[in-house]
Interface confidence: low
């Protein structure tokens, strides 16, 4: 640890005196003290001499000697008082900035330790301190205001009693800053606005912060609007509110509105869009195709997006047929609001039955009128197949009827032996029927096709199979000729019942 000579904690001298402070350490040493005039510094290896031959009140302060090379960071200090009868205070800083709840040191150093008993801290012009100000005094350091509050941001003077009169220091401005977590919080209401020309509208931009020092403005497109600001303070936050009231909107009021607030921490902004329309509107749309195909037994959700202003006065889902007069159960209809002017309406159709194919219409009404959006729902079925033996124009013919949706295509197979289903090893011949005759093809119903296979003579130890398939599945029917006639065989696995 370095050693200071003279080896006293405090030194009291008169103005104009010569002061020599010597510091000796094991290695090189450094002096640190208040910035003041007239000091000269002389260093010689492990010692350093700080001296002045004309001490002034401004030399009052604590001088510390440190040894930079010392791993323990030891230091020694001496406090110098230059007792000037005309200058009881040496003010080291005229502005002190702290955050709320920190201790604020007002660095007015007493130049004469004898005056300590008569010191006080006042606000400028001799005003008393604010109530609840908790402070302490150190002749070496000055006055400390403990746990400073924002409201204590004032100009202070240190007062000393000299010969029965109070002598003030120059003023020290204390700035107590709020601990600001970030830019002001913002709200812009509404998030979106639509009005018919001539209607009234209101847009409210509000910002809040723990500190009053922030700015807020509302701009339309890129023009800052001159709106009177309402200020408030509640829940320990300052609030600034800008309210734009438009009695009769016109097209020039439309566009983008931005609420912008800024403070020392930065800027926040939020925007909304204001649409001005000539008249009421009601638009229905769907992201889905209006023509839907679903496999029987599966489920489907029909979704309609509604954009409307003014709001809807009524809406419902309707089944338009053709199978029955049943109507969708209300519990299966669901409405969700995306925002003020956009809504999504969903109709859930679980485990679809054949009788539920057909047209579903969503109807909605507002002052702009009625609108409807209709979905066409067709059910998909795997093919059902049947084969019969008949004579057409005197020729023996196998007649295969296949029914399903989408329209099934048909393939005939002839294979050796008697079997429920031909396998590759047994196949003797294959005939594709690219154009089977369509027997029935009504909307929302299965398509029934018919394929004819003319057979001159039925081979008795063989099987004739009609296979039909579509995108949903396949079906087949095996025809086995027997001497007593013909035996038809649907495959065991084909037990589909819709």
């Amino acid at each position: 640890i370095p050693v200071i000579e003279p080896s006293v904690p405090e030194l009291v001298v008169k103005p104009g005196a010569t002061v020599t402070l010597r510091c000796v350490g094991n290695g090189s040493v450094e002096w640190d003290g208040p910035p003041s005039p007239h000091w000269t510094l002389y260093s010689d290896g492990s010692s350093s001499i700080l001296s002045t031959n004309n001490a002034t009140f401004q030399n009052t302060g604590t001088y510390r000697c440190t040894e930079p090379g010392d791993p323990l960071g030891g230091s020694a200090a001496i406090h110098l008082y230059v007792k000037d009868p005309a200058r009881p205070w040496n003010v080291l800083a005229q502005e002190v900035v702290v955050f709320e709840d920190q201790d604020a040191l007002l660095p007015c150093l007493l130049t004469d330790p004898v005056l300590e008993a008569g010191v006080s801290l006042v606000r400028v012009r001799g005003r008393p301190l604010m109530r609840h100000t908790n402070y302490s005094f150190s002749p070496w350091h000055g006055f400390t205001i403990h746990r400073a509050k924002f409201i204590q941001s004032q100009d202070y003077q240190c007062s000393a009693l000299m010969g029965g009169r109070k002598v003030m220091s120059i003023s020290i401005r204390l700035k107590v800053q709020k601990v600001i977590p970030g830019p002001p919080a913002l709200t812009l209401v509404p998030a979106e606005l639509v009005r018919i020309r001539g209607e009234a509208a209101q847009i409210v931009c509000s910002a809040s912060s723990v500190d009053v020092n922030f700015d807020v403005f509302l701009q339309h497109n890129n023009t800052k609007l001159a709106i009177p600001q309402q200020s408030d303070f509640h829940n320990n936050r300052y609030q600034k509110v800008l309210t734009l009231n438009l009695d009769q909107v016109d097209f020039q009021h439309a566009g983008n509105y931005s609420c912008v607030a800024s403070n020392v921490q930065g800027k926040h902004s939020t925007s909304m869009f204001f649409r001005v329309v000539e008249s009421a509107y009601l638009n229905l749309s769907s992201e889905q195709n209006l023509i839907q195909e679903v496999t029987v037994g599966e489920g489907l959700n029909l979704k309609v997006m509604v954009e409307a202003y003014p709001g809807l006065q009524g809406f419902n889902w309707t089944y338009l047929g053709p199978f029955s007069d049943h109507q969708p159960e209300p519990k299966l209809a669901n409405a969700t609001t995306k925002d003020t002017y956009r809504h999504t309406f969903t109709l859930s159709l679980p485990r679809l039955k054949p009788s539920e194919a057909g047209r579903y219409s969503f109807l909605a009404r507002n002052p702009g009128g009625w609108r409807a959006l209709t979905f066409e729902l067709t059910l998909r079925y795997p093919p059902e197949v049947s084969v019969i033996w008949t004579f057409i124009n005197g020729s023996g013919t196998l007649l295969c009827a296949a029914s399903g949706y989408p329209q099934p295509n048909v393939t005939w197979l002839q294979c050796s032996g008697h079997t429920d289903r031909c396998d590759e090893a047994q196949v003797l011949q294959v005939w594709d029927d690219p154009y089977p005759e369509v027997l029935s093809q009504e909307p929302f119903h299965k398509v029934t096709v018919q394929s004819l296979l003319t057979v001159e003579t039925l081979e008795h130890n063989q099987t004739y199979e009609c296979r039909a398939h579509n995108s949903v599945g396949s079906g087949s029917w095996a025809f086995i000729p027997i001497s007593a006639g013909a035996h038809t065989h649907p495959p065991d696995e084909f037990l589909f019942t819709p």
Partner: antibody
Framework: EVQLVESGGGLVKPGGSLRLSCAAS????????MSWVRQAPGKGLEWVGR??????????DYAAPVKGRFTISRDDSKNTLYLQMNSLKTEDTAVYYC?????????????????WGQGTTVTVSS | DIQMTQSPSSLSASVGDRVTITCQAS??????LNWYQHKPGKAPKLLIY???NLETGVPSRFSGSGSGTDFTFTISSLQPEDIATYYC????????FGGGTKVEIK
């Protein structure tokens, strides 16, 4: 006699600048805290800002509407107070008064704005 | 900033009437309040300083009272030369004027 005389008012366009002066006499100007106060047409008195004496740090304070646009300075050697007004707005149109806020004369200290100039008119208009 | 709310904004009274004007501060300002008289075309005049002290040369019919947040200015017997606008002003933290009270004679 304690006296304040303002000058420098006039007509200026929005966004323009103007510098007002206030010549002081009859008291120790260097010890005084000086303020500017204005009165817009049909409105009340509004404090603009102040400058403290050099012995009290010579610091300045401003009212919110003018902060960042107006600058108060002093030349103690000329016993003169100044108000530099930049980025002027139409709402800055007013009669501007220079006034003492706190000053010493003959060993007695006076608090309150008891010395006022006659006022100088500033008109901001396009 | 400290706000000063002055009321009424205007009043009409007869010569010899007692006139009272109130001023309310948005926070405690101790007694750091002045009252001024302002006549058209003239510079304002300090009447009362530190809430209740009468400025030298001001007639004794003018008086002030109050401390903290509520202050009162009184003209005990209104005279024709008292027609003016009166302002309160705080100097506890920066300076703020009240909105003014215009006094007229009936």
């Amino acid at each position: 006699e304690v006296q304040l005389v303002e000058s420098g008012g006039g007509l200026v366009k929005p966004g323009g600048s103007l510098r007002l002066s206030c010549a002081a006499s009859g008291f120790t100007f260097s010890n005084a805290w000086m303020s500017w106060v204005r009165q817009a047409p049909g409105k009340g008195l509004e404090w603009v800002g102040r400058i403290k004496s050099k012995t009290d740090g010579g610091t300045t304070d401003y009212a919110a509407p003018v902060k960042g646009r107006f600058t108060i300075s002093r030349d103690d050697s000329k016993n003169t107070l100044y108000l530099q007004m930049n980025s002027l707005k139409t709402e800055d149109t007013a009669v501007y008064y220079c006034t003492t806020e706190y000053y010493g004369s003959g060993g007695v200290w006076y608090y309150g704005m008891d010395v006022w100039g006659q006022g100088t008119t500033v008109t901001v208009s396009s | 900033d400290i706000q000063m709310t002055q009321s009424p904004s205007s009043l009409s009274a007869s010569v010899g009437d007692r006139v009272t004007i109130t001023c309310q501060a948005s926070q405690d300002i101790s007694n750091y309040l002045n009252w001024y008289q302002h006549k058209p075309g003239k510079a304002p005049k300090l009447l009362i300083y530190d809430a209740s002290n009468l400025e030298t040369g001001v007639p004794s019919r003018f008086s002030g009272s109050g401390s903290g947040t509520d202050f009162t200015f009184t003209i005990s017997s209104l005279q024709p030369e008292d027609i003016a606008t009166y302002y309160c002003q705080q100097y506890d933290n920066l300076l703020t004027f009240g909105g003014g009270t215009k006094v007229e004679i009936k």
